[in-house]
Protein backbone atom coordinates (compact mmCIF):
# COMPACT_ATOMS: atom_id res chain seq x y z
CA UNK A 1 0.00 0.00 0.00
CA UNK A 2 2.79 2.39 1.02
CA UNK A 3 4.68 1.54 -2.18
CA UNK A 4 1.63 2.32 -4.34
CA UNK A 5 1.13 5.63 -2.51
CA UNK A 6 4.79 6.58 -2.88
CA UNK A 7 4.74 5.70 -6.57
CA UNK A 8 1.46 7.50 -7.21
CA UNK A 9 2.60 10.59 -5.31
CA UNK A 10 5.92 10.56 -7.15
CA UNK A 11 4.06 10.43 -10.45
CA UNK A 12 1.72 13.32 -9.51
CA UNK A 13 4.57 15.48 -8.17
CA UNK A 14 6.62 14.84 -11.32
CA UNK A 15 3.61 15.60 -13.51
CA UNK A 16 3.14 18.97 -11.80
CA UNK A 17 6.88 19.62 -12.04
CA UNK A 18 7.07 18.86 -15.76
CA UNK A 19 3.98 20.99 -16.42
CA UNK A 20 5.82 23.78 -14.57
CA UNK A 21 9.00 23.26 -16.61
CA UNK A 22 6.94 23.49 -19.84
CA UNK A 23 5.19 26.63 -18.52
CA UNK A 24 8.49 28.25 -17.50
CA UNK A 25 10.06 27.47 -20.89
CA UNK A 26 7.15 29.09 -22.71
CA UNK A 27 6.87 32.12 -20.39
CA UNK A 28 8.02 35.54 -21.58
CA UNK A 29 9.09 36.82 -18.17
CA UNK A 30 12.50 35.22 -17.71
CA UNK A 31 14.00 38.65 -17.18
CA UNK A 32 12.08 41.79 -16.36
CA UNK A 33 13.07 45.43 -16.38
CA UNK A 34 14.47 46.50 -13.03
CA UNK A 35 12.24 49.26 -11.71
CA UNK A 36 14.23 49.97 -8.57
CA UNK A 37 16.49 53.02 -8.59
CA UNK A 38 15.81 53.54 -12.30
CA UNK A 39 14.20 56.48 -14.09
CA UNK A 40 10.44 55.85 -14.19
CA UNK A 41 9.73 54.63 -17.70
CA UNK A 42 6.39 54.63 -19.47
CA UNK A 43 7.26 51.19 -20.83
CA UNK A 44 7.97 47.87 -19.14
CA UNK A 45 10.44 45.56 -20.88
CA UNK A 46 10.61 41.84 -20.28
CA UNK A 47 12.26 38.95 -22.09
CA UNK A 48 11.81 35.21 -22.47
CA UNK A 49 13.78 32.43 -24.13
CA UNK A 50 11.95 32.89 -27.42
CA UNK A 51 10.92 36.55 -27.62
CA UNK A 52 11.15 39.95 -25.95
CA UNK A 53 8.13 42.05 -25.03
CA UNK A 54 7.33 45.65 -24.21
CA UNK A 55 4.22 46.70 -22.31
CA UNK A 56 3.37 50.37 -22.73
CA UNK A 57 1.60 52.39 -20.07
CA UNK A 58 -1.60 52.22 -22.12
CA UNK A 59 -1.54 48.45 -21.61
CA UNK A 60 -0.56 47.76 -25.21
CA UNK A 61 1.91 44.88 -25.32
CA UNK A 62 4.17 44.16 -28.26
CA UNK A 63 6.35 41.06 -28.53
CA UNK A 64 9.10 40.31 -31.05
CA UNK A 65 10.48 36.82 -31.57
CA UNK A 66 14.21 36.11 -31.77
CA UNK A 67 14.18 35.22 -35.44
CA UNK A 68 17.91 34.63 -35.54
CA UNK A 69 19.62 31.50 -34.32
CA UNK A 70 23.27 32.29 -34.88
CA UNK A 71 23.01 35.83 -33.54
CA UNK A 72 21.79 34.76 -30.10
CA UNK A 73 24.13 34.49 -27.10
CA UNK A 74 25.56 31.00 -26.55
CA UNK A 75 24.29 31.04 -22.97
CA UNK A 76 20.72 31.61 -24.14
CA UNK A 77 21.06 28.73 -26.57
CA UNK A 78 22.41 26.55 -23.77
CA UNK A 79 19.48 27.44 -21.51
CA UNK A 80 17.02 26.66 -24.31
CA UNK A 81 18.74 23.28 -24.85
CA UNK A 82 18.68 22.41 -21.15
CA UNK A 83 14.99 23.25 -20.83
CA UNK A 84 14.05 21.29 -23.94
CA UNK A 85 16.08 18.27 -22.81
CA UNK A 86 14.36 18.53 -19.44
CA UNK A 87 10.92 18.59 -21.08
CA UNK A 88 11.70 15.68 -23.44
CA UNK A 89 13.14 13.52 -20.64
CA UNK A 90 10.24 14.43 -18.38
CA UNK A 91 7.67 13.60 -21.03
CA UNK A 92 9.27 10.21 -21.74
CA UNK A 93 9.50 9.62 -17.99
CA UNK A 94 5.80 10.35 -17.61
CA UNK A 95 4.94 7.94 -20.41
CA UNK A 96 7.07 5.18 -18.88
CA UNK A 97 5.77 5.82 -15.36
CA UNK A 98 2.12 5.54 -16.46
CA UNK A 99 2.77 1.90 -17.46
CA UNK A 100 4.82 1.35 -14.32
CA UNK A 101 2.05 2.43 -11.93
CA UNK A 102 1.10 -0.44 -9.60
CA UNK A 103 -2.56 0.54 -9.73
CA UNK A 104 -2.67 0.08 -13.50
CA UNK A 105 -2.71 -3.49 -14.83
CA UNK A 106 -1.34 -4.11 -18.31
CA UNK A 107 -1.63 -7.75 -19.37
CA UNK A 108 0.49 -10.02 -17.20
CA UNK A 109 3.28 -7.53 -16.55
CA UNK A 110 5.50 -8.80 -13.77
CA UNK A 111 6.44 -6.74 -10.72
CA UNK A 112 10.08 -6.87 -11.75
CA UNK A 113 9.20 -5.16 -15.06
CA UNK A 114 7.17 -2.51 -13.23
CA UNK A 115 10.06 -1.98 -10.85
CA UNK A 116 12.41 -1.56 -13.79
CA UNK A 117 10.11 0.98 -15.42
CA UNK A 118 9.59 2.84 -12.14
CA UNK A 119 13.34 3.15 -11.66
CA UNK A 120 13.81 4.25 -15.29
CA UNK A 121 11.13 6.95 -15.01
CA UNK A 122 12.50 8.05 -11.63
CA UNK A 123 15.97 8.55 -13.08
CA UNK A 124 14.46 10.42 -16.05
CA UNK A 125 12.57 12.72 -13.69
CA UNK A 126 15.69 13.38 -11.65
CA UNK A 127 17.71 14.27 -14.77
CA UNK A 128 14.78 16.34 -16.11
CA UNK A 129 14.56 18.30 -12.87
CA UNK A 130 18.31 18.84 -12.80
CA UNK A 131 18.23 20.09 -16.41
CA UNK A 132 15.53 22.62 -15.55
CA UNK A 133 17.30 23.79 -12.39
CA UNK A 134 20.58 24.07 -14.30
CA UNK A 135 18.95 25.98 -17.17
CA UNK A 136 17.24 28.45 -14.87
CA UNK A 137 20.38 28.88 -12.76
CA UNK A 138 22.56 29.55 -15.82
CA UNK A 139 20.08 32.23 -16.96
CA UNK A 140 19.94 33.72 -13.45
CA UNK A 141 23.75 33.87 -13.31
CA UNK A 142 23.76 35.58 -16.72
CA UNK A 143 21.27 38.16 -15.39
CA UNK A 144 23.27 38.84 -12.24
CA UNK A 145 26.46 39.35 -14.27
CA UNK A 146 24.73 41.69 -16.74
CA UNK A 147 22.95 43.54 -13.92
CA UNK A 148 26.16 44.51 -12.18
CA UNK A 149 27.85 45.32 -15.47
CA UNK A 150 25.04 47.71 -16.41
CA UNK A 151 25.01 49.16 -12.88
CA UNK A 152 28.71 49.95 -13.22
CA UNK A 153 27.99 52.06 -16.30
CA UNK A 154 24.32 52.86 -15.72
CA UNK A 155 24.64 56.07 -17.70
CA UNK A 156 26.94 55.92 -20.68
CA UNK A 157 27.74 59.54 -21.39
CA UNK A 158 28.21 60.73 -24.95
CA UNK A 159 30.50 63.70 -24.86
CA UNK A 160 29.17 64.54 -21.42
CA UNK A 161 26.01 66.00 -22.93
CA UNK A 162 23.63 63.26 -24.00
CA UNK A 163 22.92 60.31 -21.74
CA UNK A 164 21.63 56.89 -22.66
CA UNK A 165 19.78 55.10 -19.90
CA UNK A 166 20.79 51.47 -19.80
CA UNK A 167 17.86 49.15 -19.11
CA UNK A 168 18.75 46.78 -16.30
CA UNK A 169 17.04 43.43 -16.08
CA UNK A 170 16.27 41.38 -12.98
CA UNK A 171 14.76 37.95 -12.24
CA UNK A 172 11.41 37.32 -13.89
CA UNK A 173 8.58 35.08 -12.71
CA UNK A 174 9.65 32.27 -15.06
CA UNK A 175 12.87 31.75 -13.11
CA UNK A 176 10.97 31.03 -9.90
CA UNK A 177 8.49 28.83 -11.73
CA UNK A 178 11.43 26.95 -13.26
CA UNK A 179 13.25 26.47 -9.96
CA UNK A 180 10.13 25.21 -8.18
CA UNK A 181 9.12 23.01 -11.11
CA UNK A 182 12.61 21.54 -11.41
CA UNK A 183 12.64 20.83 -7.69
CA UNK A 184 9.25 19.13 -7.83
CA UNK A 185 10.34 16.97 -10.77
CA UNK A 186 13.49 16.04 -8.87
CA UNK A 187 11.50 15.13 -5.74
CA UNK A 188 9.04 13.15 -7.84
CA UNK A 189 11.92 11.24 -9.41
CA UNK A 190 13.42 10.42 -6.02
CA UNK A 191 10.01 9.18 -4.84
CA UNK A 192 9.75 6.93 -7.91
CA UNK A 193 13.19 5.47 -7.16
CA UNK A 194 12.17 4.82 -3.56
CA UNK A 195 8.93 3.20 -4.76
CA UNK A 196 10.97 1.00 -7.09
CA UNK A 197 12.72 -0.63 -4.10
CA UNK A 198 9.38 -1.61 -2.63
CA UNK A 199 8.08 -2.93 -5.94
CA UNK A 200 11.03 -5.21 -6.63
CA UNK A 201 10.47 -8.83 -5.54
CA UNK A 202 13.49 -9.81 -3.47
CA UNK A 203 15.46 -13.03 -3.63
CA UNK A 204 15.23 -14.39 -0.09
CA UNK A 205 18.59 -15.72 0.91
CA UNK A 206 17.48 -16.21 4.47
CA UNK A 207 17.49 -19.69 6.05
CA UNK A 208 14.56 -19.96 8.37
CA UNK A 209 15.00 -22.62 11.03
CA UNK A 210 12.08 -24.43 12.72
CA UNK A 211 12.61 -25.70 16.20
CA UNK A 212 10.28 -28.56 17.22
CA UNK A 213 9.44 -28.52 20.87
CA UNK A 214 8.14 -31.69 22.43
CA UNK A 215 4.50 -32.17 21.64
CA UNK A 216 3.96 -29.29 19.23
CA UNK A 217 5.66 -27.68 16.30
CA UNK A 218 6.45 -23.97 16.79
CA UNK A 219 8.14 -22.32 13.82
CA UNK A 220 10.36 -19.24 14.15
CA UNK A 221 11.08 -17.45 10.90
CA UNK A 222 13.74 -14.79 11.01
CA UNK A 223 14.39 -12.42 8.10
CA UNK A 224 12.24 -9.36 8.59
CA UNK A 225 9.16 -8.16 6.77
CA UNK A 226 10.00 -9.49 3.33
CA UNK A 227 10.68 -13.07 4.45
CA UNK A 228 7.65 -13.23 6.68
CA UNK A 229 5.20 -12.05 4.05
CA UNK A 230 5.04 -15.47 2.45
CA UNK A 231 3.33 -17.20 5.35
CA UNK A 232 0.68 -18.75 3.11
CA UNK A 233 3.06 -19.88 0.41
CA UNK A 234 4.23 -23.39 -0.40
CA UNK A 235 7.38 -24.31 1.40
CA UNK A 236 9.68 -27.24 0.99
CA UNK A 237 11.29 -28.71 4.06
CA UNK A 238 14.65 -30.42 4.11
CA UNK A 239 15.44 -32.75 6.97
CA UNK A 240 18.78 -31.81 8.46
CA UNK A 241 19.01 -33.89 11.62
CA UNK A 242 16.71 -36.02 13.69
CA UNK A 243 16.55 -33.37 16.39
CA UNK A 244 13.74 -31.72 14.40
CA UNK A 245 15.49 -28.64 13.07
CA UNK A 246 14.35 -27.89 9.49
CA UNK A 247 15.27 -25.20 6.91
CA UNK A 248 12.51 -23.53 5.00
CA UNK A 249 13.18 -21.87 1.64
CA UNK A 250 10.54 -19.87 -0.18
CA UNK A 251 9.57 -21.50 -3.47
CA UNK A 252 8.57 -18.24 -5.16
CA UNK A 253 11.86 -16.39 -4.95
CA UNK A 254 13.28 -14.75 -8.05
CA UNK A 255 16.70 -13.20 -8.17
CA UNK A 256 16.41 -9.46 -8.87
CA UNK A 257 18.94 -6.77 -9.65
CA UNK A 258 16.92 -4.39 -7.46
CA UNK A 259 17.62 -6.32 -4.28
CA UNK A 260 20.39 -3.98 -3.24
CA UNK A 261 19.44 -0.56 -4.58
Amino acid sequence: MAVTACQGLGFVVSLIGIAGIIAATCMDQWSTQDLYNNPVTAVFNYQGLWRSCVRESSGFTECRGYFTLLGLPAMLQAVRALMIVGIVLGAIGLLVSIFALKCIRIGSMEDSAKANMTLTSGIMFIVSGLCAIAGVSVFANMLVTNFWMSTANMYTGMGGMVQTVQTRYTFGAALFVGWVAGGLTLIGGVMMCIACRGLAPEETNYKAVSYHASGHSVAYKPGGFKASTGFGSNTKNKKIYDGGARTEDEVQSYPSKHDYV
Partner: antibody, heavy 120, light 113 residues
Framework: EVQLVESGGGLVQPGGSLRLSCAAS????????MHWVRQAPGKGLEWVAY????????YYVDKLKGRFTVSRDNAKNSLYLQMTSLRAEDTAVYYC?????????????WGQGTLVTVSS | DIVMTQSPDSLAVSLGERATINCKSS????????????LAWYQQKPGQPPKLLIY???TRESGVPDRFSGSGSGTDFTLTISSLQAEDVAVYYC?????????FGGGTKVEIK
Protein backbone atom coordinates in the same frame (compact mmCIF):
# COMPACT_ATOMS: atom_id res chain seq x y z
CA GLU B 1 -16.78 59.71 -31.59
CA VAL B 2 -14.27 60.23 -28.75
CA GLN B 3 -15.14 63.24 -26.62
CA LEU B 4 -13.45 64.69 -23.56
CA VAL B 5 -15.10 67.62 -21.78
CA GLU B 6 -13.36 69.42 -18.91
CA SER B 7 -15.21 71.42 -16.27
CA GLY B 8 -14.67 72.97 -12.85
CA GLY B 9 -12.29 75.76 -13.84
CA GLY B 10 -12.68 79.34 -12.69
CA LEU B 11 -11.24 82.08 -10.54
CA VAL B 12 -9.73 81.02 -7.23
CA GLN B 13 -7.69 82.86 -4.61
CA PRO B 14 -4.08 81.86 -3.83
CA GLY B 15 -4.05 79.05 -1.27
CA GLY B 16 -7.50 77.95 -2.38
CA SER B 17 -8.62 74.62 -3.81
CA LEU B 18 -10.37 73.53 -6.96
CA ARG B 19 -11.56 70.22 -8.39
CA LEU B 20 -11.49 69.76 -12.13
CA SER B 21 -13.56 67.09 -13.87
CA CYS B 22 -13.28 65.48 -17.26
CA ALA B 23 -16.29 63.64 -18.70
CA ALA B 24 -15.39 61.02 -21.27
CA SER B 25 -17.59 59.48 -23.95
CA UNK B 26 -17.29 57.59 -27.23
CA UNK B 27 -14.84 54.97 -25.96
CA UNK B 28 -14.44 52.41 -23.18
CA UNK B 29 -13.14 54.78 -20.52
CA UNK B 30 -12.18 52.00 -18.08
CA UNK B 31 -9.69 50.58 -20.60
CA UNK B 32 -7.58 53.71 -21.05
CA UNK B 33 -5.05 55.59 -19.00
CA MET B 34 -5.66 59.35 -18.75
CA HIS B 35 -3.44 62.42 -18.52
CA TRP B 36 -3.77 65.99 -17.32
CA VAL B 37 -1.73 68.60 -19.23
CA ARG B 38 -1.74 72.33 -18.60
CA GLN B 39 -0.78 75.40 -20.61
CA ALA B 40 -0.11 78.77 -19.02
CA PRO B 41 -1.33 81.76 -21.09
CA GLY B 42 1.02 82.31 -24.04
CA LYS B 43 3.30 79.49 -22.89
CA GLY B 44 4.03 75.91 -23.89
CA LEU B 45 2.50 72.63 -22.80
CA GLU B 46 3.32 71.14 -19.39
CA TRP B 47 2.45 67.58 -18.48
CA VAL B 48 0.82 67.35 -15.02
CA ALA B 49 -0.21 63.79 -14.19
CA TYR B 50 -1.14 60.34 -15.44
CA UNK B 51 -3.53 57.77 -14.02
CA UNK B 52 -3.71 54.25 -15.42
CA UNK B 53 -6.96 52.51 -16.33
CA UNK B 54 -7.15 50.73 -12.97
CA UNK B 55 -6.08 53.83 -10.94
CA UNK B 56 -2.63 52.41 -10.26
CA UNK B 57 0.05 53.42 -11.02
CA UNK B 58 -0.31 57.21 -10.86
CA TYR B 59 2.49 59.59 -11.86
CA TYR B 60 2.88 63.33 -11.24
CA VAL B 61 5.34 65.98 -12.27
CA ASP B 62 7.63 66.41 -9.24
CA LYS B 63 6.88 70.06 -8.56
CA LEU B 64 3.14 69.41 -8.19
CA LYS B 65 3.38 66.27 -6.06
CA GLY B 66 1.53 66.68 -2.79
CA ARG B 67 -0.64 69.57 -3.98
CA PHE B 68 -2.38 67.90 -6.92
CA THR B 69 -4.25 64.59 -6.79
CA VAL B 70 -5.57 62.74 -9.82
CA SER B 71 -8.40 60.21 -9.53
CA ARG B 72 -11.03 58.56 -11.70
CA ASP B 73 -14.44 56.95 -11.47
CA ASN B 74 -14.77 54.35 -14.19
CA ALA B 75 -18.44 53.79 -13.40
CA LYS B 76 -19.13 57.47 -14.17
CA ASN B 77 -16.62 57.73 -17.06
CA SER B 78 -15.01 60.61 -15.21
CA LEU B 79 -11.51 61.84 -14.50
CA TYR B 80 -10.70 64.31 -11.71
CA LEU B 81 -7.87 66.63 -10.69
CA GLN B 82 -7.98 67.90 -7.12
CA MET B 83 -5.81 71.01 -6.76
CA THR B 84 -4.94 72.44 -3.34
CA SER B 85 -2.73 75.30 -2.07
CA LEU B 86 -3.07 76.98 -5.45
CA ARG B 87 -0.52 79.59 -6.52
CA ALA B 88 -0.49 82.29 -9.19
CA GLU B 89 1.80 80.11 -11.34
CA ASP B 90 -0.91 77.43 -11.50
CA THR B 91 -2.95 79.75 -13.72
CA ALA B 92 -3.41 77.83 -16.97
CA VAL B 93 -5.76 76.04 -19.29
CA TYR B 94 -6.03 72.45 -18.02
CA TYR B 95 -6.56 69.73 -20.59
CA CYS B 96 -7.46 66.11 -20.02
CA UNK B 97 -6.09 63.74 -22.64
CA UNK B 98 -6.37 60.04 -23.39
CA UNK B 99 -3.32 57.78 -23.34
CA UNK B 100 -3.62 56.23 -26.77
CA UNK B 101 -3.46 52.48 -27.32
CA UNK B 102 -0.66 51.27 -29.62
CA UNK B 103 0.56 54.83 -30.26
CA UNK B 104 3.80 54.58 -28.26
CA UNK B 105 2.30 56.28 -25.17
CA UNK B 106 1.26 59.38 -27.11
CA UNK B 107 -1.84 61.38 -26.13
CA UNK B 108 -4.25 60.76 -28.97
CA UNK B 109 -7.38 62.69 -27.92
CA TRP B 110 -7.61 65.96 -26.01
CA GLY B 111 -10.42 67.91 -24.44
CA GLN B 112 -11.04 71.60 -25.17
CA GLY B 113 -9.60 72.59 -21.79
CA THR B 114 -10.85 74.52 -18.78
CA LEU B 115 -9.23 77.77 -17.60
CA VAL B 116 -8.07 78.04 -14.00
CA THR B 117 -7.14 81.52 -12.83
CA VAL B 118 -5.40 81.92 -9.47
CA SER B 119 -5.54 85.55 -8.43
CA SER B 120 -6.37 87.68 -5.44
CA ASP C 1 13.71 64.97 -15.90
CA ILE C 2 14.24 64.68 -19.64
CA VAL C 3 14.81 68.07 -21.25
CA MET C 4 13.33 68.49 -24.73
CA THR C 5 14.94 71.28 -26.77
CA GLN C 6 13.17 72.46 -29.91
CA SER C 7 14.66 74.61 -32.63
CA PRO C 8 13.99 77.06 -34.07
CA ASP C 9 11.54 78.89 -31.77
CA SER C 10 9.73 80.24 -34.82
CA LEU C 11 9.84 79.55 -38.53
CA ALA C 12 8.53 81.53 -41.49
CA VAL C 13 8.14 79.51 -44.69
CA SER C 14 6.56 80.31 -48.07
CA LEU C 15 3.46 78.37 -49.12
CA GLY C 16 4.43 75.14 -50.83
CA GLU C 17 7.92 75.21 -49.34
CA ARG C 18 9.46 72.72 -46.92
CA ALA C 19 9.43 73.41 -43.19
CA THR C 20 11.76 71.53 -40.86
CA ILE C 21 11.56 71.51 -37.06
CA ASN C 22 14.21 69.90 -34.87
CA CYS C 23 13.87 68.35 -31.42
CA LYS C 24 16.69 67.16 -29.19
CA SER C 25 16.25 65.17 -25.98
CA SER C 26 18.69 65.05 -23.06
CA UNK C 27 18.45 61.25 -22.99
CA UNK C 28 17.86 58.66 -25.67
CA UNK C 29 14.20 57.97 -26.35
CA UNK C 30 15.01 54.69 -28.04
CA UNK C 31 13.68 51.82 -25.96
CA UNK C 32 16.12 48.90 -26.19
CA UNK C 33 13.37 46.34 -25.58
CA UNK C 34 11.67 46.89 -28.93
CA UNK C 35 14.08 49.26 -30.69
CA UNK C 36 11.32 51.88 -30.97
CA UNK C 37 11.62 55.61 -30.37
CA UNK C 38 9.12 57.12 -27.94
CA LEU C 39 8.68 60.60 -29.30
CA ALA C 40 5.48 62.31 -30.44
CA TRP C 41 4.74 65.49 -32.38
CA TYR C 42 1.66 67.66 -31.77
CA GLN C 43 0.11 70.53 -33.67
CA GLN C 44 -1.72 73.28 -31.80
CA LYS C 45 -3.68 75.91 -33.65
CA PRO C 46 -4.71 79.15 -31.89
CA GLY C 47 -7.59 78.62 -29.45
CA GLN C 48 -7.58 74.83 -29.94
CA PRO C 49 -6.23 71.88 -27.99
CA PRO C 50 -3.15 70.08 -29.32
CA LYS C 51 -3.63 67.39 -31.95
CA LEU C 52 -1.45 64.29 -32.30
CA LEU C 53 0.40 64.23 -35.63
CA ILE C 54 3.24 61.71 -35.26
CA TYR C 55 3.99 59.01 -32.67
CA UNK C 56 6.91 56.65 -32.33
CA UNK C 57 9.07 59.37 -33.96
CA UNK C 58 7.93 58.49 -37.48
CA THR C 59 4.42 56.99 -37.57
CA ARG C 60 1.65 59.28 -38.80
CA GLU C 61 -1.57 59.28 -36.81
CA SER C 62 -4.60 58.29 -38.89
CA GLY C 63 -6.12 61.22 -40.75
CA VAL C 64 -2.90 63.25 -40.76
CA PRO C 65 -1.90 64.43 -44.27
CA ASP C 66 1.16 62.71 -45.73
CA ARG C 67 2.99 66.00 -46.12
CA PHE C 68 3.82 65.62 -42.42
CA SER C 69 6.65 63.22 -41.70
CA GLY C 70 8.81 62.45 -38.71
CA SER C 71 12.33 61.07 -38.58
CA GLY C 72 15.25 60.59 -36.25
CA SER C 73 16.31 58.21 -33.53
CA GLY C 74 17.81 58.25 -30.06
CA THR C 75 18.15 61.90 -29.15
CA ASP C 76 17.72 63.81 -32.42
CA PHE C 77 14.36 64.07 -34.16
CA THR C 78 12.87 66.06 -37.01
CA LEU C 79 9.36 66.99 -38.10
CA THR C 80 9.11 67.89 -41.77
CA ILE C 81 6.21 69.55 -43.58
CA SER C 82 7.09 68.83 -47.21
CA SER C 83 4.81 71.48 -48.75
CA LEU C 84 3.48 74.08 -46.32
CA GLN C 85 -0.26 74.87 -46.56
CA ALA C 86 -2.09 77.81 -45.04
CA GLU C 87 -3.86 75.48 -42.54
CA ASP C 88 -0.50 74.33 -41.21
CA VAL C 89 0.08 77.63 -39.42
CA ALA C 90 0.34 76.52 -35.79
CA VAL C 91 2.68 75.80 -32.91
CA TYR C 92 4.35 72.37 -33.05
CA TYR C 93 5.49 70.50 -29.95
CA CYS C 94 7.62 67.40 -29.52
CA UNK C 95 7.11 65.20 -26.49
CA UNK C 96 9.12 62.55 -24.64
CA UNK C 97 6.87 59.50 -24.25
CA UNK C 98 9.43 57.17 -22.67
CA UNK C 99 10.19 58.63 -19.25
CA UNK C 100 7.94 60.14 -16.61
CA UNK C 101 7.39 63.04 -16.39
CA UNK C 102 6.35 63.14 -20.07
CA UNK C 103 8.07 66.39 -20.93
CA PHE C 104 7.27 68.63 -23.92
CA GLY C 105 9.57 70.75 -26.03
CA GLY C 106 9.20 74.52 -25.87
CA GLY C 107 7.31 74.64 -29.17
CA THR C 108 8.04 75.98 -32.65
CA LYS C 109 5.74 78.55 -34.19
CA VAL C 110 5.29 78.03 -37.95
CA GLU C 111 4.11 81.04 -39.98
CA ILE C 112 3.66 81.90 -43.66
CA LYS C 113 6.42 84.06 -45.15
Amino acid sequence: EVQLVESGGGLVQPGGSLRLSCAASGFTFSSFGMHWVRQAPGKGLEWVAYISSGSSPIYYVDKLKGRFTVSRDNAKNSLYLQMTSLRAEDTAVYYCARAGYAVRNALDYWGQGTLVTVSS
Amino acid sequence: DIVMTQSPDSLAVSLGERATINCKSSQSLLNVGNQKNYLAWYQQKPGQPPKLLIYGASTRESGVPDRFSGSGSGTDFTLTISSLQAEDVAVYYCQNDLFYPLTFGGGTKVEIK
